[in-house]
Interface confidence: medium
């Protein structure tokens, strides 16, 4: 079950819930946003204060890391399996250091299997964080510091830090280095969403959340 099912079962308070995959006993703890846009959102990534190191290995990004109440990555394997069960939407919520907020909403999102390097698939962009997708289209394979699957002759994950669906290296990286206020400009390896804040601007906060399309 995901946060949408938790919501439908009567739990309408934001918080950390234990989720499971269909036909599986494997459990994962995730933060559920039960208020935003009707609730039922499973948070798959959050950045807010730089308390968690996001320069992690392939295995760590596979299984997840961090604290679901704070900064964390839910895990590529869980998200891949979940988003291949039914159609999901992806909402990415962004905050800058000037008090502005924006979002990108993709009407269809799923990750390929690990054998296909958790390649991201996205369709139907709307929202206020740019008319062009800051996640390169068509989607790229996931790369980490120990798994170079990008389209650059360089190693994007090593240079820019963090695991991401790097192109060469692409217009976004929400798992980059966390830079505090007044140190957040001219930072190519920061938390980037190019088509909202341009080059070199490192964001204050990000949340990636998913929900079934038919919720």
């Amino acid at each position: 079950r995901d946060c949408a099912e938790v919501f439908k079962s009567g739990h309408t308070t934001n918080g950390v819930y234990t989720l499971t995959l269909p036909n599986s006993t494997e459990e994962v703890k995730a933060y559920c946003d039960m208020e935003a846009g009707g609730g039922g959102w499973t948070i798959i990534q959050r950045r807010e204060d730089g308390s968690v190191d996001f320069q992690r290995t392939w295995k760590e990004y596979k299984v997840g890391f961090g604290n679901p109440s704070g900064e964390y990555w839910l895990g590529n394997e869980f998200v891949s399996q979940l988003t291949n069960q039914q159609r999901y939407v992806l909402k990415i919520h962004l905050k800058d250091w000037e008090g502005n907020e924006a979002y990108s909403l993709y009407e269809h999102f799923y990750l390929s299997s690990e054998e296909l390097n958790y390649r991201i698939h996205l369709k139907g962009l709307t929202g206020t964080a740019g008319k062009i997708s800051s996640i390169s289209q068509p989607g790229n394979d996931f790369s980490t510091k120990d798994a170079d699957n990008d389209k650059c002759i360089c190693k994007c994950s090593q240079m820019l830090t963090g695991g991401w669906w790097f192109d060469a290296c692409g217009p976004s990286n929400l798992n980059g280095m966390y830079y505090p206020q007044r140190q957040n400009t001219n930072k190519f390896n920061g938390i980037k969403w190019y088509y909202w804040k341009g080059s070199g601007y490192s964001l204050k906060g990000t949340t990636m959340m998913i929900r079934p399309a038919d919720f």
Epitope: C154, C156, L160, A168, F188, N189, G198, S199, G200
Partner: antibody, heavy 122, light 107 residues
Framework: EVQLLESGGGLVQPGGSLRLSCAAS????????MSWVRQAPGKGLEWVSV????????YYADSVKGRFTISRDNSKNTLYLQLNSLRAEDTAVYYC???????????????WGQGTLVTVSS | DIQMTQSPSSVSASVGDRVTITCRAS??????LAWYQQKPGKAPKLLIY???SLQSGVPSRFSGSGSGTDFTLTISTLQPEDFATYYC?????????FGGGTKVEIK
Amino acid sequence: EVQLLESGGGLVQPGGSLRLSCAASGFTFRKYAMSWVRQAPGKGLEWVSVISVSGGNTYYADSVKGRFTISRDNSKNTLYLQLNSLRAEDTAVYYCAKDLTDIVLMVYVDYWGQGTLVTVSS
Amino acid sequence: DIQMTQSPSSVSASVGDRVTITCRASQDIDRWLAWYQQKPGKAPKLLIYAASSLQSGVPSRFSGSGSGTDFTLTISTLQPEDFATYYCQQANSLPFTFGGGTKVEIK
């Protein structure tokens, strides 16, 4: 094979203008940041300007700011540098340069053109 | 602006020698440094990026090290084709700046 072919250089009087072009082939031009780097005769390398993949972000060395303009036409796979109010100290070979990545704030040049000579003299 | 200072400005060496060139940044640039080789009348060629990452196709006798303000380019066994001028360049912040160059000459 990546190729960058500059053109447009030549002799120009102080205060004059030139437009340099760089025709790119062998790679997906629209996916990479592009730069201009120059080298005065017998001197070292000097970074001039860089432009982002979309053309929306441009940056310049202080020595050329307000006089030079970098632009790109992704449909034509071409990079440009408009040189105005030219001075004798702008005399140099101008290289068109492809970045290793698309990150406009990190210029590692992995491919260079052959260069085009700009001579500013009366 | 970040100033990049290379030393020595020239070095005389023989084929087979180990050659070390240093580059110092006027402020911390983490590991955002590149090394280029340039031969007379030719465009520069990228050897090393991100301080120590060897560019594809570059012989393994070239290596880079360092972080912060002090960086080194080493040619482990000098070959005849390595006689050239070498430049370091910081990619940490705008404006991007190059070192003055080090000319490796035949002894």
